[in-house]
């Protein structure tokens, strides 16, 4: 028995162009949580198949709201480890699925809404009792960084957690070839004699006479550190003072894995975890065929015409992905307009519209000019979710129903008197002034400050500006 532990370090945009927008917004704050599913062996099963080794759900992360206009940062994470207890032996090789979920905290019908943001999967070899292994996985434009380890629960010990500890027979020390059962120092491993000289700290054995090394150690007695030992970030040259490794360029930089493979660092190099349908050191070889049953969720497998596409999965309605492994979220089609909230109900799409909008896709502005009449020859002008009437001369108000007093604003300058007229207004100018609004002084010499006269008129001729 033991526990598989997963520590999420970061979840955010991956490198390269096309960074994703934050999954949360001011309108729709949200928080993340994670789910891990473990299966024994290297079989890559459907995401929906049972998590035979166990599964765990993280706590919810802090509530996050996108800063307007900002690219998606690394998103705030839940505290603590995800722990998956296993009852029997640790299998040594296992498959994992880690899902990043978004909990939307907006005004939801029936409580919060959950949606799957990203899913990564891989297959790994891992000895129980070893140090934390680091990994980076990509899912679309997102990148997940995490560490994991398997540890045995006392009294089990060993790489598979199959050896048990026994109470000490002598009060002071364990018998020859046996080690204390840390952390139960008052117990000893059941008798199993490793190769003479096998490092008690860095070596172990599952058969008498052998000496197997924990990750980061090598040599016949596990006494020689490999070049990337003991540091969480196994990169770069050794620091002279600490003996720990300083981060430097790593073997996974630039992702050497082709065809969507994900890279994980190993003590000496890197290892590619290939998606279904590919294998080889860098996932460069395509090999899965329909005989391998690669299509999930009832997808129909059709053999490809060439090695480049050894098979194609024709997905049933509601599923997508190269292996029909993803449930179609039709909301990803972005069907709702004007900030409407999309709900994929399975049988139909629904858009929940913001106030002021309506229609199956929130495409109708309820305050627009449709069905609105502006009276007395006024014209309707749309804008910003509201409408207004631009009224004909002599009318005012929201719908141009109010007769306006054109003289109310005292439009005649220099003491001119205003008269309401069917065509607008007329200004009777005081002596010495002229113009439609009495704005031009008449000069004593007979010339005026009028603009250039229209053809056929000389400055100073009587004119009526209306």
């Amino acid at each position: 028995a033991g526990v598989f532990e997963l520590q999420i370090h970061s979840f955010g945009p991956g490198p390269g162009p096309g960074a994703p927008r934050s999954p949360c917004s001011a309108r729709l704050p949200c928080r993340l949580f994670f789910r891990v599913c473990l299966k024994p062996g290297l079989s890559e099963e459907a995401a929906e198949s049972p998590c035979a080794l166990g599964a765990a759900l993280s706590a919810r992360g802090p509530v996050y709201t996108e800063q307007p206009g900002a690219p998606a940062p690394d998103l705030p994470l839940p505290d603590g480890l995800l722990q998956v207890p296993f009852r029997d032996a640790w299998p040594g090789t296992f498959s994992f699925i880690i899902e990043t979920w978004r909990e939307e905290l907006g005004d939801q019908i029936g409580g919060p809404a959950w949606s799957l943001l990203a899913r990564v999967a891989g297959r790994r070899r891992l000895a129980a009792g070893g140090p934390w292994a680091r990994d980076i996985q990509r899912a679309g434009a997102w990148e997940l960084r995490f560490s994991y380890r398997a540890r045995c629960e006392p009294p089990a010990v060993g790489t598979a957690c199959t050896r048990l500890c026994r109470p000490r027979s002598a009060p002071s020390r364990c018998g020859p070839g046996l080690r204390p059962c840390a952390p139960l120092e008052d117990e000893c491993e059941a008798p199993l004699v490793c190769r003479a000289g096998c490092s008690p700290e860095h070596g172990f054995c599952e058969q008498p006479g052998e000496c197997r090394c924990l990750e980061g150690w090598t040599g016949p007695l596990c006494t020689v550190p490999v070049s990337t030992s003991s540091c969480l970030s196994p990169r770069g040259p050794s620091s002279a003072t600490t003996g720990c490794l300083v981060p430097g360029p790593g073997p996974c930089d630039g992702n050497p894995c082709a065809n969507g493979g994900s890279c994980s660092e190993t003590p000496r190099s890197f290892e590619c975890t290939c998606p279904r349908g590919f294998y080889g050191l860098r996932c460069e070889v395509s090999g899965v065929t329909c005989a391998d049953g690669p299509c999930f969720n009832g997808g129909l497998c059709v053999g490809g015409a060439d090695p480049d596409s050894a098979y194609i999965c024709h997905c049933p309605p509601g599923f997508q992905g190269s292996n029909c492994e993803k449930r179609v979220d039709r909301c990803s089609l972005q069907p709702c307009r004007n900030g409407g909230l999309c709900l994929d109900l399975g049988h139909a799409l629904r858009c929940r519209c913001r106030a002021g909008f309506a229609g199956p896709r929130c495409e109708h502005d309820l305050d627009d000019c449709a069905g609105r009449a502006c009276a007395n020859g006024g014209t309707c002008v749309e804008g910003g979710g509201a409408h207004r009437c631009s009224c004909a001369l002599g009318f005012g108000g929201r719908d141009c129903r109010e007769r306006a007093d054109p003289c109310a604003a005292r439009p005649c300058a220099h003491g001119g008197r205003c008269y309401a007229h069917f065509s607008g207004l007329v200004c009777a100018c005081a002596p010495g002034y002229m113009g439609a609004r009495c704005e031009f002084p008449v000069h004593p010499d007979g010339a005026s400050a009028l603009p250039a006269a229209p053809p056929g008129l000389r400055p100073g001729d009587p004119q009526r500006y209306l």
């Epitope: 096309g18 960074a19 994703p20 927008r21 999954p23 943001l117 679309g140 434009a141 309605p317 997508q320 179609v328 039709r330 990803s332 089609l333 972005q334 069907p335 709702c336 307009r337 858009c351 199956p360 896709r361 495409e363």
Partner: antibody
Framework: QIQLVQSGPELKKPGETVKISCKAS????????MHWVKQAPGKGLKWMGW????????GYADDFKGRFAFSLETSASTAYLQINNLKNEDTATYFC??????????WGQGTSVTVSS | DIQMTQTTSSLSASLGDRVTISCRAS??????LNWYQQKPDGTVKLLIY???RLHSGVPSRFSGSGSGTDYSLTISNLELEDIATYFC?????????FGGGTKLEIK
């Protein structure tokens, strides 16, 4: 006004890769998903799939899984279609189109891709 | 996948004619039926969406109707600029599918 402007025609050899761009203007790019449609010479229109411009998540029609990849450069309001390991049957005009919730309401002018040895 | 069938692959009509192009879906598509026009130069434009709604900027001589599995596009007064190929498309279920097209020519 709303416009989708695609990159120019391409002449490629079998086995090569082509990347077509579709630059959007006149609207908020991340509010509408972008779709790709193929038209082989003398044939009809065939929907290839879409990409969510907010999350970058693509969705592919069955016939376009594997060698085809949709991507975005959101800061440039640009969507891309990449076709790897080109084959003769990829010879076609490829259109990008914006989806408004009911239909593909605005289309690019199309990019002709010719694959010939 | 939903099959979309345009039984008439080409038709000839005279200027001023009333022209109807039909389209049939292999199952009920709940009015999620759109019509597109592709001009001889290759440009594609949306004409009608959701069976009968006219896209902005499209002349009112174009109209659409139908329900369930049977839909049609009507051009009430054929003009020279309407010479094009017309495609129907269902948007009810993924994958979206197009009809084979109807090429409209002038007599």
């Amino acid at each position: 006004q709303i416009q989708l402007v695609q990159s120019g025609p391409e002449l490629k050899k079998p086995g090569e890769t082509v990347k077509i761009s579709c630059k959007a203007s006149g609207y908020t790019f991340t509010d509408y998903s972008m779709h790709w449609v193929k038209q082989a010479p003398g044939k009809g229109l065939k929907w290839m799939g879409w990409i969510n411009t907010e999350t970058g998540e693509p969705g592919y029609a069955d016939d376009f899984k594997g060698r085809f990849a949709f991507s975005l450069e959101t800061s440039a309001s640009t969507a891309y279609l990449q076709i790897n390991n080109l084959k003769n049957e990829d010879t076609a005009t490829y259109f990008c189109a914006r989806y408004d919730g009911y239909a593909m309401d605005y289309w690019g002018q199309g990019t002709s891709v010719t694959v010939s040895s | 996948d939903i099959q979309m069938t345009q039984t008439t692959s080409s038709l000839s009509a005279s200027l001023g004619d009333r022209v109807t192009i039909s389209c049939r879906a292999s199952q009920d598509i709940s009015n999620y039926l759109n019509w597109y026009q592709q001009k001889p130069d290759g440009t594609v434009k949306l004409l009608i969406y959701y069976t009968s709604r006219l896209h902005s900027g499209v002349p009112s001589r174009f109209s659409g109707s139908g329900s369930g599995t049977d839909y049609s596009l009507t051009i009430s007064n054929l003009e020279l600029e309407d010479i094009a190929t017309y495609f129907c498309q269902q948007g009810d279920m993924l994958p979206w599918t197009f009809g084979g097209g109807t090429k409209l020519e002038i007599k």
